[in-house]
């Protein structure tokens, strides 16, 4: 119906458009202003959600068209606004007006089950009328339009066990079901709209109904009799065999427990395999064929969980008979004890009896034994099982011995048993005490009488029942050493005191003091020990801490100035050597282009003061140093080793300083004049030409620090191949050609 609105001048209506129209555009209605006289002066405008996309207006006539297929279920109402505009001015002729486009419903949606999949579980044997599940279908159509969304439910599949309430969708049981016959049911429910009238749309759903188990079956043994055998050697816990009972129920309702009956000695037990529900008969105690060779027992099975109301189904539990035959075995020897602890004092002569072990054959034939001993060569065993010593034992070497005695049957050597034998060696006082450490003792030249020079202590390798106690004495034989005196502190330490004021380093650089140390053992043992005391120039401070560093050089007779000079020389030599090395490495061109040299370079690091033998395994130094133009020399490496070994001896022995100084100076002179001696601790790179060269070595290693020159003029006579060498190493003045 057209509506005339006198205030606004609009002629319009509330528009309806059916959903799902298949035409490209569908005419809905017309907006018209009664001010429009058709004089091409008005323009109609459509505004709001859907304007210009879902709905289009003919701006000339006001005709509204739907240009898209509408779906009421997606959107059922459109609120739009209309304007009428004067084309000449571009202004609205009247106020904007709101109107409604309603999408009318058609029955285009079938009922749908939104909660799929439907799955229900109901106990087996449930009575008729038991609630199973409720299914609900939804219809997207308009419930206020006819019966578009009025649904009825119908059971398509599932009779005679189930039924559905037509209006609610509630599924109920209509007859009892046994899970052991069938455990799953597939029910199909149909939902129809329009109350099932012609033209109705329908949808279906499948309901999977599982029957849950109730414990309405008892377990029953598959067999009424089982026969098993067991070896008498089988250990406790051995599985003898499996028995099996079946229960038609599942899960917890099929869980069963087996029990043993008629087994007074409690030798057997049954455990259950939770995966297979089998009963495993196991050995609870050891069996002995010699004692009993046959056992007859009965096993019973019952469910673990039985509800009270289902108890009648479980009366008269199923039983089975089990016969166990014990098999005889040749058993290994058995020691009387699992292990033995024997004791013996140290120092006993070999052949001393330590103790006896014994093993027997448990079988009826009682085979004789043969014994073997392993674990130490200090012991032996005879056929009676008696263990004797084969050496004198020293507790300080080993206080315990862990031996293994093996017994074998003489009738069957394969039958072996072993036992551990622990031998404890008792202590006797057979070790004298000694200094607890090496003492590097110094006394200052300006020491005063009564000044503490050293505190000494002792150790004893013997074991003491009570604590060790040591007694210190100055040897009476040591008559020349009245310069020092010893005082026993009665606490296992003693103090060495200066017995005079002032010492002279040059006249008497070293003193040797003989000290006797006795222990409190029975019998008591005494040792003689020598303490070396070195005289040191401590300066005014009278502090001996720096003596250890200065000792050697001062003994040699060097003063501070000499030490500084030696250090500077060493640094200069090092600097010079590294400069040469750097220059050599920077040089790209080879010295002799005609023949490439074969260099073998070896770097050796000696972290110890002695040794140096490793280099002889890498290359032959003598071979490298050999030259027809040089006098034979001892290899420098061995010389330096000699010097080092003498240095080490000097710390311990301390020979006459003048002799030592003379020796060092000789060695320094020899090293200085040696043309093939590199600086000490330097990196040595040997360019070895090989034997047979009449020129000997041309290496820079062969150079000297003296003015002596080698004559290489003979290189001129070796022909054109040596022309370049001759020019480099020959005499400076060349003969005129």
């Amino acid at each position: 119906d057209y509506k005339d609105d006198d205030d606004k001048g609009w002629v319009w209506n509330q528009f309806f458009v059916p959903e799902e129209m298949n035409t490209t555009s569908h005419h809905i209605g017309q907006l018209r202003s009664d001010l429009d006289n058709g004089n091409n002066s008005f323009q109609y405008k459509l505004l709001g959600a859907g304007a210009g996309s879902t709905f289009i207006i003919d701006e000339r006539t006001g005709d509204i068209y739907a240009i898209q297929k509408l779906d009421r279920e997606e959107r059922s109402l459109y609120i739009l606004r209309a304007q009428v505009i004067d084309i000449a001015t571009g202004r609205a002729v009247e106020p904007e007006s709101e109107f409604v486009i309603k999408v009318s419903d058609i029955n285009d949606n079938e009922p749908r089950f939104l909660d799929e999949p439907y799955e229900a579980i109901v106990p087996e044997m449930s009575p008729e009328g038991t609630f199973v599940i409720k299914v609900t279908a939804n219809d997207a159509d308009d419930p206020s339009t006819g019966y578009h969304a009025r649904i009825l439910y119908n059971l398509e599949r599932g009779q005679p066990y189930f039924s559905v309430e037509p209006t609610t969708g509630v599924i109920r049981i209509s007859s009892k079901m046994d899970r052991e016959l069938q455990d799953t049911y597939c029910v199909i429910i149909q939902a129809k709209d329009m109350l099932g009238q012609p033209g109705a749309l329908s949808g279906t759903t499948t309901v999977s109904i599982k029957l849950s188990d109730i414990n309405d079956n008892k377990p029953i043994f598959k067999e009424s009799f089982y026969r098993f055998t067991i070896s008498e050697s089988a250990p406790i816990g051995t599985s003898i065999g499996k028995i099996m009972a079946y229960d038609d129920d599942i899960g917890e309702n099929a869980e069963m427990e087996y029990s043993i009956e008629d087994d007074d000695s409690k030798i057997f037990d049954i455990i259950i395999d939770n995966d297979t529900q089998e009963g495993i008969v196991i050995l609870k105690k050891k069996v002995d064929f010699e004692q009993q060779s046959y056992y007859g027992i009965r096993a019973k099975v019952k469910n673990c969980h039985v509800d009270e109301e289902l108890a009648p189904a479980h009366v008269n539990a199923s039983t089975t008979y089990i016969k166990v035959q014990v098999e005889d075995e040749d058993e290994p020897p058995v020691f009387l004890l699992p292990y033995y602890i024997l004791e013996i004092p140290e120092g006993k002569p070999y052949g001393t009896i330590v103790g006896t072990v014994s093993a027997t054959d448990p079988d009826r034939r009682q085979s004789p034994m043969r014994y073997y001993l392993t674990g130490s060569k200090m012991f032996d065993i005879n056929d009676n099982g008696t263990i004797i010593t084969t050496n004198m034992l020293d507790r300080e070497v080993s206080a315990w011995y862990n031996l293994t005695v093996t017994a074998t049957e003489t009738y069957n050597v394969q039958q072996i048993s072993s036992a551990h034998v622990y031998v404890q060696v008792f202590n006797i006082n057979d070790n004298a005490p000694e200094f607890s450490q090496f003492y590097e003792t110094y006394v200052c030249e300006n020491a005063e009488s009564g000044e503490i020079v050293q505190i000494i202590s002792a150790i004893d390798r013997d074991e003491s029942i009570e604590d060790h106690h040591f007694y210190f004495n100055h040897s009476l034989e040591d008559t020349n050493n009245s310069s020092f005196m010893l005082t026993d502190n009665q606490d296992n330490t003693a103090v060495i005191l200066s017995n005079r004021t002032g010492f002279n380093l040059k006249e008497e650089p070293v003193f040797y003091m003989i000290i006797l140390i006795a222990d409190n053992g029975i019998p008591s043992l005494t040792s003689t020990n020598t303490l070396t005391i070195q005289v040191c120039d401590c300066g005014d401070s009278r502090n001996t801490e720096t003596c250890a560093n200065k000792g050697l050089l001062f003994i040699m007779g060097f003063r501070t100035e000499a030490i500084i000079a030696i250090m500077i020389c060493v640094m200069v030599i090092f600097g010079f050597f590294f400069l040469i090395l750097a220059l050599k490495q920077r040089r790209k061109e080879t010295l002799f282009p005609e023949k490439t040299e074969d260099f073998r370079e070896n770097i050796f690091c000696y972290d110890d003061e002695g040794g140096g033998e490793e280099d002889s395994e890498a290359f032959d130094i003598v071979e490298l140093r050999q030259s027809t133009v040089m006098r034979e020399r001892k290899p420098q490496r061995s010389k330096s080793a000699e010097i080092r070994s003498l240095y080490r001896q000097s710390l311990q022995v301390g020979p006459d300083s003048a002799i030592f100084r003379k020796f060092i100076l000789e060695k320094l002179e020899e090293a200085n004049t040696d043309p093939c001696a590199p600086p000490f601790d330097s990196l040595q790179t040997f360019a070895y030409e090989g034997t047979g060269s009449s020129a000997g070595s041309l290496s820079s290693l062969a150079s000297r620090d003296t003015d002596q020159e080698d004559d290489f003029d003979y290189l001129n006579d070796l022909g054109p191949r040596f022309k370049r060498l001759a020019s480099m190493f020959g005499s400076a003045v060349q003969p005129n050609n």
């Epitope: 490209t24 005419h27 091409n40 003919d58 701006e59 505009i85 000449a88």
Partner: antibody, heavy 122, light 108 residues
């Protein structure tokens, strides 16, 4: 640029329906108004009616009872059907486009087809 | 319906001359919604002027339109040989759209 091409039978029997199609090329049929105009031999021009792409139509009252104009946006075409034709309907039929895009009212015809001659004769 | 009357029916002029074509409406044309077209033999009409005075795209400036209400004029300031054709006026101010009967411009 937009071009128009009329097509249809050149001869129609009296009392039958004249059917013509105008194909729009070089542009979209959407958002413009499309008209049919005819010109009898040796005479002036006569406006038949228009269609908007959404299907909205307006016809000349003198022909309204016999005229149907339709649109097929998917093919970019619009059509004319004139029923119960007589010899007076013999003319050169043109399709044309209003020059104003989505205009509020009518406008001059800025693009024309070449025209197709339809003769009504038995 | 608005009836449009064009005058003269035929106009004979020489190239270079000025041509004045008249169009009279039976009632006032709203918003000056009047257009002029040129049609040559065997061709479709061609839009010259819309809105009584606005030249269409590509139309030479020797063509001009004027008038309002009921009286409208098309003027060709200096005739060119290609300008000799039939000229129609059209109103689109009120439905239905109507055309004049046409003025034939011929070469003298």
């Amino acid at each position: 640029q937009v071009q128009l091409q009329e097509s249809g039978p050149g001869l129609v029997k009296p009392s039958e329906t004249l059917s013509l199609t105008c194909t729009v090329s070089g542009g979209s049929i959407n958002s413009y108004y499309w008209s049919w105009i005819r010109q009898p031999p040796g005479k002036g021009l006569e406006w038949i009616g228009y269609i908007y792409y959404i299907g909205s139509t307006n016809y000349n009252p003198s022909l309204k009872s016999r005229v149907t104009i339709s649109v097929d946006t998917s093919k970019n075409q619009f059509s004319l059907k004139l029923s119960s034709v007589t010899a007076a309907d013999t003319a050169l039929y043109y399709c044309a486009r209003d020059s104003r895009y989505r205009s509020g009212w009518y406008d001059a015809f800025d693009i024309w087809g070449q025209g197709t001659m339809v003769t009504v004769s038995s | 319906d608005i009836v449009l009357t064009q005058s003269p029916g035929t106009l004979s002029l020489s190239p270079g001359e000025r041509a004045t074509l008249s169009c009279r409406a039976s009632q006032s044309v709203a918003g000056s919604y009047l257009a002029w077209y040129q049609q040559k033999p065997g061709q479709a009409p061609r839009l010259l002027i819309s809105g009584a005075s606005s030249r269409a795209t590509g139309i030479p400036d020797r063509f001009s339109g004027s008038g309002s209400g009921t009286d409208f004029t098309l003027t060709i300031s200096r005739l060119e040989p290609e300008d000799f054709a039939v000229y129609y006026c059209q109103q689109y101010g009120k439905s239905p759209i109507t055309f004049g009967q046409g003025t034939r411009l011929e070469m003298k």
